[in-house]
């Protein structure tokens, strides 16, 4: 085995000392004779030591002993001791006691033989064993006076060899992480939690991270155990972006032909049923009514025009009922209703005229007389020397209950090429030209158009009381929506509880899966803010899709084009959600089509207005938007623009 040089020297020195021993003893006897018993000169001392260094060391001190104790001849025992000690440079011992194994007297010098771990001439310097190859330690080497020892980093323990370290498995202690998962690591361990949770070392448990405090969402943030959801102002036309945190505009993904005709007059603009046009004719010269116009509608019922005086005098109303023209008239307080002619709500243009002759009224469709009614009197009524006639289009100047036969006055129809009293009508033309809301879509098809800016609502009852008196009433919500969407986000159908400001039920288009945080085009069925079922839909293909929803005690289904959607809740959760819905249905609820009122964005998965064509059937009854309790004026009740043809 090879030893470091320093250790080898230390090992050899005692052997060397033993070799000198005989010589040393002889030298001591020689010294006795020459310099203790006798007074010796320098030369004589040189002969004893046989070298200059020892002689040079000895002789000055020898003279000091003579000065101190007198010459050898005085026979002072102190002198003999003084001289005998002079050649032994280890007396008194110059070496460090702690670090010296032995002191070796040399010729005028000495050598300190150091213990292991010490060094220096006097063995007073600690040797740092750690400075070379870490003292042989695997991790930490601790130097100490004359020695060293190995230790390990936290999480490791020293092996039996005193040098190597081995990892401590903290996870072997079941209490290490408490409720959290323990993962052993080299020299350490980690307490792990599911995503959205953080480990609390004080509580030794996983605690939900409130991501909302980190300001992750651009608009509204809702924290949930282990997650969070961002919400955007749907009513403001916003939806979640791809990153599921920021908001972006809801943009049409299918272009509809929404171009309008400046030479047309839309009759369905005023949901209140009030006229879209009011004309006041006054003449000095007695005049008869002549009105002619082109007309187009899919609407089966509504008022085209009124002509005459106030409600108790003389007037006529030209209306549509069950798709056919109806004339209601009141002459001098006597009312009549006549209906005749073909069904004209086929959506094609036709020319309609009303002409007041001497003793009768003639109604024509495409120049063919469909009604000829004998009348006694004139529509222009004299008053203070002038003849007056009020003419209103798309409504009547009084309440519909005061008609001869009540009718829903709202008419989603279009008029063009109108001519009142054979006069040129620049007033209406000018007004219509600058007001696009008074204009009709250039082309329309059957359906109802939701422009993405409003809703309609109804007051419908979903509770059914069985015939057996005393039995519990049941409930049912069955919705069939025929949709041709223009945008990928929006509420199709919803129930709103005004008293609680809650959304008990909603069916909507959405372009992401909220829990999976995944962009995907879906139809969502939800009770309040909880999605019950989801179904994929190709929303931007320009085609008509059928969304069917059926909810009753114990079951909830969602279908898109005949394919059943996937449930998002457990059976127990479903029952709990349906119980919530039933509780709401026992109180007053309003049925919304195409959007929601101003509710918090967290009330339902979607709050945005629907854009596109849609007809709704609720509990096997087709909803007529003209019959709604309220309808946004931009929703067209019985017409929808077609999808724009793809550019060649």
């Amino acid at each position: 085995a090879l030893l470091p040089a320093r250790e080898a020297t230390q090992f050899l020195r005692p052997r060397q000392r033993r070799a000198f021993q005989v010589f040393e003893e002889a030298k001591q006897g020689h010294l006795e004779r020459e310099c203790v018993e006798e007074l010796c000169s320098r030369e004589e001392a040189r002969e004893v030591f046989e070298n200059d260094p020892e002689t040079d060391y000895f002789y000055p001190r020898y003279l000091d002993c003579i000065n101190k104790y007198g010459s050898p001849y005085t026979k002072n025992s102190g002198f003999a001791t003084c001289v005998q000690n002079l050649p032994d440079q280890c007396t008194p011992n110059p070496c460090d006691r702690k670090g010296t194994q032995a002191c070796q007297d040399l010729m005028g010098n000495f050598f300190c033989l150091c213990k292991a771990g010490w060094g220096g001439r006097l063995c007073d310097k600690d040797v740092n064993e750690c400075s070379q190859e870490n003292g042989g330690c695997l991790q930490i080497c601790h130097n100490k006076p004359g020695s060293f020892h190995c230790s390990c980093h936290s999480g490791f323990e020293l092996s039996s060899d005193g040098r190597t370290c081995q990892d401590i498995d903290e996870c072997a202690d079941s209490e290490a992480c408490g409720e959290a998962r323990c993962k052993n690591l080299p020299g350490s361990y980690s307490c792990l939690c599911d995503e959205g949770f953080a480990y609390s070392s004080q509580e030794k448990a996983c605690r939900d991270v409130d991501e909302c405090l980190q300001g992750r969402c651009e608009q509204v943030c809702v924290n949930s155990p282990g997650s969070y959801t961002c919400h955007c102002d749907g009513r403001g036309g916003l939806k979640l972006s791809q990153d599921m945190d920021t908001c972006e505009d809801i943009l049409p993904c299918v272009p509809f032909s929404v171009a309008k005709s400046v030479k047309s007059l839309y009759l369905g603009r005023m949901f209140s049923g009030t006229p879209v046009i009011r004309l006041r004719f006054k003449r000095l010269q007695p005049t008869r009514l002549v009105a002619e116009f082109d007309f187009r509608t899919f609407d089966p019922e509504g008022i085209l025009l009124f002509a005459g005086g106030h409600q108790d005098s003389t007037w006529i109303v030209l209306a549509l009922r069950a798709g056919r023209l109806e004339l209601q008239l009141r002459y001098n307080g006597v009312g009549r209703v006549t209906s005749s002619g073909p069904v004209i709500n086929h959506g094609m243009w036709q020319t309609i005229s009303v002409e007041e002759l001497a003793r009768n009224l003639v109604i024509k469709v495409n120049r063919d007389a469909v009604m000829k009614i004998a009348v006694a009197g004139d529509l222009f009524q004299p008053e203070r020397g002038l003849y007056h006639l009020n003419l209103t289009v798309g409504g009547i100047p009084f309440h519909e209950k005061d008609l001869v036969q009540p009718i829903n006055p709202r008419l989603d129809g279009c008029m063009r090429s109108w001519n009142w009293l054979n006069g040129e009508d620049t007033t209406i033309q000018e007004t219509v030209k600058v007001n696009t809301r008074m204009q009709c879509f250039s082309v329309t098809e059957r359906g109802s158009f939701y422009p993405g800016s409003g809703f309609a609502f109804y007051s419908l009852d979903y509770m059914r009381t069985p015939l057996d008196v005393g039995t519990e009433s049941t409930w049912e919500v069955e919705v069939v929506a025929h949709i041709r969407p223009a945008a990928d986000t929006g509420v199709l159908f919803a129930l709103w509880a005004p008293d609680l400001r809650a959304v008990p039920l909603s069916v909507a288009l959405v372009d992401y899966h909220s829990t999976k945080k995944l962009k995907k085009q879906l139809v969502v069925l939800a009770v309040e803010h909880t999605a019950l079922a989801l179904m994929e839909i190709k929303v931007c293909d320009g085609q008509e899709h059928v969304v069917t929803v059926s909810l009753r005690d114990g079951e909830a289904t969602l279908e898109v084009d005949g394919t059943r959607g996937q449930s998002e809740v457990s059976a127990a959760q479903l029952q709990e959600r349906l119980a919530v819905l039933e509780r709401h249905l026992r109180s007053p609820v309003l049925t919304f089509a195409g959007g929601l009122p101003d509710v918090p964005v967290t009330s339902a998965p979607v709050t945005a207005f629907y854009r596109g064509c849609m007809t709704l059937e609720v509990n096997r009854r087709l909803l007529d938007l003209d019959e709604a309790a309220y309808k946004h004026s931009d929703i067209t009740a019985h017409s929808c623009p077609p999808v724009e043809p793809a550019a060649a």
């Epitope: 006041r280 004719f281 006054k282 003449r283 000095l284 010269q285 007695p286 005049t287 203070r384 020397g385 002038l386 009293l421 054979n422 006069g423 040129e424």
Partner: antibody
Framework: QVHLVQSGPELKKPGASVKISCKAS????????MNWVRQAPGQGLKWMGW????????TYTEEFKGRFVFSLDTSVTTSYLQISTLKAEDTATYFC?????????WGQGTLVTVSS | ETTLTQSPSSLSVSTGDRVTITCITS??????MNWYQQKPGKPPKLLIS???TLRPGVPSRFSSSGSGTDFTLTISSTQPEDFADYYC?????????FGQGTKVEIK
Amino acid sequence: QVHLVQSGPELKKPGASVKISCKASGYTFTNYGMNWVRQAPGQGLKWMGWINTNTGEPTYTEEFKGRFVFSLDTSVTTSYLQISTLKAEDTATYFCARDEGWFVYWGQGTLVTVSS
Amino acid sequence: ETTLTQSPSSLSVSTGDRVTITCITSTDIDDDMNWYQQKPGKPPKLLISEGNTLRPGVPSRFSSSGSGTDFTLTISSTQPEDFADYYCLQTDSVPLTFGQGTKVEIK
């Protein structure tokens, strides 16, 4: 479009008569009555009355009863105003205007000057 | 006969000024009031017809209000082309009657 074109200016002596015309076009003449309005120099407007273009029956305001006559020739869709025994105070611009209860369409006006 | 009292008879204004002309009737005429503008050598031009209805082509700086017996024509910011004579006309009853007129001149 509707046009009412009146005859040119007249200079007459007191006691003479004048007949001014108003030719209508661009609409069915008999559907609307014709009104006459006088405006004396630097003065305001005065409604004189009107004529029923269906029946030819005229109506005059109190101030213009007597020397003033409204007439028609439906074949040429023209209305006339004749003033007899002219006086200096008849000096004015006379306008025809189509009956709409109010007046939308006016003739350009005919200035009648009565001076000796 | 319904008489109309129009005021002021004349007023001098600068371009951009607001002008208000009033017409008071001797009887209640509902809203059967009309307003005309007349420039020298031209026939009157209908600005506003019954029911405070602004006529097609008339600038929106012209407006009217009133019902019953008190009526007002307002020019919100007078333009150079607005310097003219203005008349009110009631069409509630025969005989039809005009106001005496208001001359709007440049200051």
